[in-house]
């Protein structure tokens, strides 16, 4: 390709408009002023530039702002955002939630790209914590966002932000993540009454300890089996048959279908068969009558 550098006579762009789609790459490079481009970035999105042309426009901005783009430009990047690399984005200082929303909108409907992940990381680090408005925005665009964070990152989520979390946002969270989120949820919802509290806390119960499950069993909550199956095994094991019956209410019948799966299987092995028989569900595998149960973990701790 011919290397041409001078802007042809009469082709200097007085503004960013659709006439520029007729410019070759070298003409865009030579005839579009970078400062003009920066001030009229909002117009770029309305013009169907080819990806090749967008590369040229990006190059012009990179030359104008070698240390990273200012937020006034970032907010109006539109589809030029898709041309940015994570390295480019690491130079940015994005503080406005409106800017974040504008760029997430560009990527809407796609998987979270490395660019978006970097952008979110920069934004959250800049804010110092995941506040409610940010979490609201991020989970609206990426329902799995919360569960993509490490337990360490989740520890920066203030309890007040938990109000923004929807049940589907926790679908892919593992027990380690729920261990971090549950105490925050418990704190956030502590002033709610029994039934309302259970509705809100239910999605987080995969991080609940035994004593909280025992407390819930006294409140007629009627926990469904899907929630029960997501509880921590170590939290379920110490529960008595009576406590599980109270916890599940009418859903207790579902235990039969789950008797071979954790945590139900492990819980059954810890119960006296006599007690299991009181449920009338035909659950098998409990401790036979007359057997003495030694808690070896307790014995080791004492010796």
């Amino acid at each position: 390709e011919v290397e041409k550098t001078a802007c042809p006579s009469g082709k200097k762009a007085p503004e960013i408009d659709e006439s520029l789609i007729f410019y070759k790459k070298w003409e865009l490079e030579a005839c579009v002023d970078a400062a003009l481009l920066a001030t009229q970035m909002d117009r770029v999105n309305a013009i169907p530039f080819t990806y090749e042309q967008l590369d040229v426009l990006k190059h012009k901005l990179d030359e104008l702002y070698p240390q990273g783009y200012p937020e006034s430009v970032i907010q109006h990047l539109g589809y030029l955002f898709l041309k940015m690399s994570p390295e480019d984005i690491r130079k940015w200082n994005v503080t406005s939630l409106e800017t974040l929303k504008a760029l997430l909108e560009v990527n809407k409907g796609h998987e979270m790209s490395p660019q978006v992940a970097t952008l979110i990381d920069r934004f959250v680090k800049g804010r110092g914590q995941l506040d409610k408005d940010t979490l609201d925005t991020l989970t609206a665009f990426y329902p799995g966002y919360l569960c993509s964070l490490s337990p360490e990152e989740l520890s920066s989520v203030p309890p007040s932000s938990i109000w923004a979390v929807r049940p589907q946002d926790l679908d892919t969270c593992d027990p380690r993540q729920l261990d971090v989120l549950y105490p925050k949820a418990r704190l956030a919802f502590q002033n709610m009454n029994g039934s309302e509290y259970f509705v809100k806390i239910q999605s987080f119960l995969g991080g609940a300890p035994t004593e909280d499950l025992k407390a819930l069993s006294q409140q007629n909550v009627s926990m469904d089996l899907a929630t029960f199956m997501k509880l921590r095994t170590d939290a379920v094991l110490p529960l008595t048959v009576a406590e599980v019956q109270k916890l599940l209410g009418p859903h207790v019948e579902g235990l039969k279908a789950e008797e071979r799966h954790r945590p139900v299987r492990d819980w059954i092995l810890r119960q006296r068969q006599d007690d299991l028989d009181t449920l009338g569900l035909g659950l098998q595998g409990g401790i036979p009558n007359g057997y003495l149960v030694l808690d070896l973990s307790m014995q080791e701790a004492l010796s």
């Epitope: 169907p48 990806y51 539109g78 589809y79 909108e105």
Partner: nanobody, 121 residues
């Protein structure tokens, strides 16, 4: 999968005419953006003509009055009628399609493989 395929290229004498056609599958030109680019030997690709409901019909200065772009919605094609052809029109002609997003702005772009147009006596 989106596919854009050009046809109609060939050898033509100066002053002659040629009609290029571009058929798309997986994307409709109606409501989106369709255009014809060309690339002459040693030159960069340039837009010749384009049309969309958002921007209307546009032509590059060198082809105004000689080239006409049109769409056939039923066949989902974008055609380029080229009249009064000269040697300077010799190039590979590419069909281009761009998705217009409902929320504004432009999405994915698609290119054809190109069709050679040679104007020579």
């Amino acid at each position: 999968e989106v596919q854009v395929v050009e046809s109609g290229g060939g050898l033509v004498q100066p002053g002659g005419s040629l009609r290029l056609s571009c058929a798309a599958s997986g994307i409709t030109f109606s409501g989106n953006y369709g255009g014809w680019f060309r690339q002459a030997p040693g030159e960069q690709r340039e837009l010749v003509a384009s049309m969309s409901s958002a921007l209307g019909t546009k032509y590059a200065d060198p082809v105004k009055g000689r080239f006409t772009i049109s769409t056939d919605t039923a066949k989902n094609t974008v055609d380029l009628q080229m009249n009064s052809l000269g040697p300077e029109d010799t190039a590979v002609y590419y069909c281009y399609a761009r998705v217009r997003l409902s929320r504004g702005g432009w999405g994915s772009e698609y290119w054809g493989q190109g069709t050679q147009v040679t104007v020579s006596s």
